[in-house]
Amino acid sequence: MMTGTIETTGNISAEKGGSIILQCHLSSTTAQVTQVNWEQQDQLLAICNADLGWHISPSFKDRVAPGPGLGLTLQSLTVNDTGEYFCIYHTYPDGTYTGRIFLEVLESSVAEHGARFQIP
């Protein structure tokens, strides 16, 4: 029985050119995390394997950095990065847990209704 839950950073609105951190945390289970995949739509961004460490997809190498922890840092954001990101936790013996984060990247000039932008 899968008892775990995934907590995420929550949805994020950020400014073009900035950087953000996507993080998920698996709790309420003693299952062993064997691998965490980060995906956007149907694209694999990165893998963190318990034994083999990090692998960043070649097409994202310039703008994606591993960590902190099992999280992922996206740099030099573009409007095209807007979308839903998935953290997929492969665990034993529970199976797969998935978290979802929606990232909205706005043009630097957009400050509609006084929106606050985050650039850590």
Epitope: E7, T8, T9, G10, N11, I12, S13, I20, I21, Q23, Q41, V79, N80, T82, G83, E84, R100, I101, F102, E104, L106, V110, E112, H113, A115, R116, F117, Q118, P120
Partner: antibody
């Protein structure tokens, strides 16, 4: 003036599929997400999902995965929602609503499309 | 999914009254950057929902200043001072911090 014009009411048979349209005007269509929300008779509002016209990306409420498919036609500034394998439970008013940039809210809404599923 | 609970379900009022509607979420609506995505809507019979408040406390354009929003974390409030006839209808809060977005169950503002 921002306007979202939805297609008219529909009466469909159980098991059928249908498409609702939402034509946007008065703003840059690709600069804002488009959401879809439904209200079943006398029930709460439910967020179905959204689409990013700029890149075609989507996000769905898992409850509606396989039931709703959201697409856009950038050339005509129109968002569409396909509703599949309809049952009486899908009878509702469906709204499109523009996303409010930077706040994960919805600022302008279409007039709603009433869908009745009945044999 | 995040569960959003609104109270009361029904709120009988007289014109000129001041009222508060509460919205509580099953987990914090503040993201890792300190932003909270909680909005309020009014849905009148035969009309589309309309945005009143976004980002907890920001009034949308054209919304009268008798509407105000407050709160943090998991606890939020919409206050309406001096109720007018056009304020009657269903009020909904919406959390947009976590996927999927979820609405509260609604509060019906009606005449006593």
């Amino acid at each position: 003036e921002v306007q979202l014009q939805q297609s008219g009411p529909e009466l469909v048979k159980p098991g059928a599929s249908m498409k609702i349209s939402c034509k946007a005007s008065g703003y840059s269509f690709t600069g804002y997400t488009m959401n879809w929300v439904r209200q079943s008779h006398g029930k709460d509002l439910e967020w179905i999902g959204l689409i990013i016209p700029y890149n075609g990306g989507t996000s769905y409420n898992q409850k509606f995965k396989g039931k709703a498919t959201i697409t856009v036609d950038k050339a005509s500034s129109t968002a569409y929602m396909d509703l599949l394998s309809l049952t009486s439970e899908d009878s509702a008013v469906y709204y499109c609503a523009r996303g409010l940039r930077g706040y994960f809210a919805m600022d302008y809404w279409g007039q709603g499309t009433s869908v009745t599923v009945s044999s | 999914d995040v569960v959003v609970t609104q109270t009361p379900l029904s709120l009988p009022v007289s014109f000129g009254d001041q009222v508060s509607i509460s919205c509580r979420s099953s987990q914090s609506l503040t993201n890792s950057y300190g932003n909270t995505y909680l909005s309020w809507y009014l849905h009148k019979p035969g009309q589309s929902p309309q945005l009143l408040i976004y980002g907890i406390s920001n009034r949308f354009s054209g919304v009268p200043d008798r509407f105000s929003g407050s709160g943090s974390g998991t606890d939020f409030t919409l206050k309406i001072s001096t109720i007018k006839p056009e304020d009657l209808g269903m009020y909904y809060c919406l959390q947009g911090t976590h996927q999927p977005w979820t609405f509260g169950g609604g509060t019906k503002l009606e005449i006593k």
